[in-house]
């Protein structure tokens, strides 16, 4: 029998401040760009090395991100959700969505020399 | 992995036209973020062009001279260029980065973009 693929999501609050260069990420999605098919979601595509956002560490490419500043980012034009994070001053908050991808083993299956309890 | 093949580069007169293409693999091309760059013998890469979902930018030289568009059923990206220059002579770069930048004005910089392919070379006589 096939291992079932299953996904962990968990949600964190990242705070982030603007380096020289900027947040240093980059996203998908909005309701005229749906990245991800039946959801117009913002995800993180790109981070880009030694920005603010690889520095701090905890944001990942493939992250949903739910809002800035406290601001929700359901339902926004993709363009729309650029400007929302260019325009989000220097201390931006970002409550993300972390999907992990977690591979379950057979079912009913225990591989010989495992612990039987 | 993202593979671009650029074509329609030649030799031309001073005054002519040429249009680049710039085509990419890949199912979600509407989300790229694009760029043509070139680099003449002897001399740095340097920006030429850049659309993204909803703008376009050119560098001060090509302005008026040049358009940037797209055709995301095709997977393509052209740069038609009329009023050649000599000073136009270079290899013509496309390049690509997946997704937006959510910061201002980065578009210029080659480091921006995660794929490039392999160059088309233009020569103005």
């Known amino acids: 029998m096939n291992g079932r693929v299953d996904y962990l999501v968990t949600e964190e609050e990242i705070n982030l401040t603007r380096g020289p260069s900027g947040l240093g990420f980059n996203i998908v999605g909005g309701t005229d760009q749906q990245y991800v098919s039946n959801d117009s979601g913002i995800y993180v595509s790109r981070i880009k090395e030694n920005g603010a956002a690889a520095l701090d560490g905890r944001l990942q490419e493939g992250d949903k991100i739910l809002s800035v500043n406290g601001q929700d980012l359901k339902n926004l034009l993709h363009q729309d959700a650029v400007d929302l994070f260019r325009n989000a001053g220097y201390a931006v908050s970002l409550r993300v969505q972390h999907r992990l991808q977690v591979q379950n083993g057979p079912i009913g299956h225990r591989g010989e020399g495992d612990p039987s309890g | 992995e993202v593979q671009l093949v650029e074509s329609g580069g030649g030799l031309v007169q001073a005054g002519g036209s040429l249009r680049l293409s710039c085509t990419a693999s890949?199912?979600?091309?509407?989300?790229?973020?694009m760029g043509w760059f070139r680099q003449a013998p002897g001399k740095e890469r340097e920006f030429v062009a850049h659309i993204s979902w909803s703008s376009t930018y050119y560098a001060d030289s090509v302005k008026g001279r040049f358009t940037i568009s797209r055709d995301n059923a095709k997977n393509t990206m052209y740069l038609q260029m009329n009023s050649l220059k000599p000073e136009d002579t270079a290899v013509y770069y496309c390049a690509v980065a997946i997704g937006s930048p959510v910061d201002s004005y980065r578009h210029r910089d080659p480091l921006e973009y995660d794929y490039w392919g392999q160059g088309t070379q233009v020569t103005v006589s």
């Open positions: 890949g199912r979600t091309f509407s989300t790229y973020t």
